[in-house]
């Protein structure tokens, strides 16, 4: 089948990184600079994406693959193929339309992106709070009091104190 197809269409023999040049009797010509073909049998090479301004080059364009961009420092990629950039926040914050805002009491975010999520409710699993939650970290649940062997010291969860200067939004 391959032999038949190539007899019918000489372009099918052109590998990735080349194009079938109609101006040169359908011979396989290398992709010109700043262009690529990621599959064989192409009649043209595609122009490489340019990562400029808000974007930086993560992977250079080659004759067989497009360039890949990421975002300028302080931002991270959003959208297919990093088509836009979203502002980073600090851990303990989430991004709103007006910028980065601290997580409300009872929620946390341990990443530079994404939203603040509620602390785990240990009691739903019949457990107790071993380590209190913060804006940046979830609570750590410990064994339930019933799981503790006689004589073992139980961790009493301290009342969730508000962090200084932090009020719920």
């Amino acid at each position: 089948f391959e032999r038949t197809r190539s007899l019918q269409d000489p372009c099918s023999n052109c590998p990735a990184g080349t194009f079938c040049d109609n101006n040169r009797n359908q011979i396989c010509s290398p992709c010109p600079p700043n262009s690529f073909s990621s599959a064989g049998g192409q009649r043209t090479c595609d122009i490489c994406r340019q990562c400029k301004g808000v974007f930086r080059t993560r992977k250079e364009c080659s004759s067989t693959s497009n360039a890949e961009c990421d975002c300028t420092p302080g931002f991270h990629c959003l959208g297919a193929g990093c088509s836009m950039c979203e502002q980073d926040c600090k851990q303990g914050q989430e991004l709103t339309k007006k910028g980065c805002k601290d997580c409300c009491f009872g929620t946390f975010n341990d990443q530079k992106r994404g939203i603040c999520r509620p602390w785990t409710n240990c009691s739903l699993d019949g457990k107790s709070v071993l380590v209190n939650g913060t804006k940046e970290r979830d609570v750590v649940c410990g064994p339930s009091p019933a799981d503790l062997s006689p004589g073992a010291s139980s961790v009493t969860p301290p009342a969730p104190a508000r962090e200084p200067g932090h009020s719920p939004q």
Epitope: N34, T44, D46, I47, C48, R49, Q50, K52, G53, V54, F55, C71, T72, F75, L78, G79, A80, G81, S83, M84, C85, E86, Q87, L95, T96, K97, K98, G99
Partner: antibody, heavy 124, light 107 residues
Amino acid sequence: QVTLKESGPVLVKPTETLTLTCTVSGFSLSNARVGVSWIRQPPGKALESLVHIFSNDEKFFSTSLKSRLTISKDTSKSQVVLTMTNMVPVDTATYYCARNGGFGVIIHDAFDIWGQGTMVTVSS
Amino acid sequence: DIQLTQSPSFLSASVGDRVTITCRASQGISSYLAWYQQKPGKAPKLLIFAASTLQNGVPSRFSGSGSGTEFTLTISSLQPEDFATYYCQQLNNYPRTFGQGTKVEIK
């Protein structure tokens, strides 16, 4: 408030050189995320990109007009200057400058702010 | 350079109509496409970037879709202020190129 304003001659003669200035305010031309483009539009026709300049002085020109165009910027004056040599009547158009490299929580590289444009007529 | 072809070039529609404009790229450009609206005597205004993301302040009746070589701009219910010319622009590489425009006129 972010603005761009084009200025330059309203009328140029064939074979003369056109010099247009884009004065920006509300942002800095030294910001690494920002680029400024010149775009033109002949009466009743489509938009045509001419040239783009970034803060690092990297420049990208229209393939068909490259030999006639120069672009420079003066960051201290907040100005981007376009020159186009050997003007001909078909260069009659409204010339716009526009910024790309959005500001805010989501940034992109479409042209988010445009000047109001300046109409240039090429005639003897 | 990447060529963009818009269809139709002219479109007559009535207030309340759903309007769809197509933009085809001469090569794949992923979702690196923007849409602009231009009214007579005015500069273009950015409506959509990254093929489908609405610019701040643009009414939600505007939407964009598509990826690769085929893109659409849809106005779900045409308003009197939407009669204008619409342009697509590729954001894949420099120089940026535009489509030839689609003029939306009152029927």
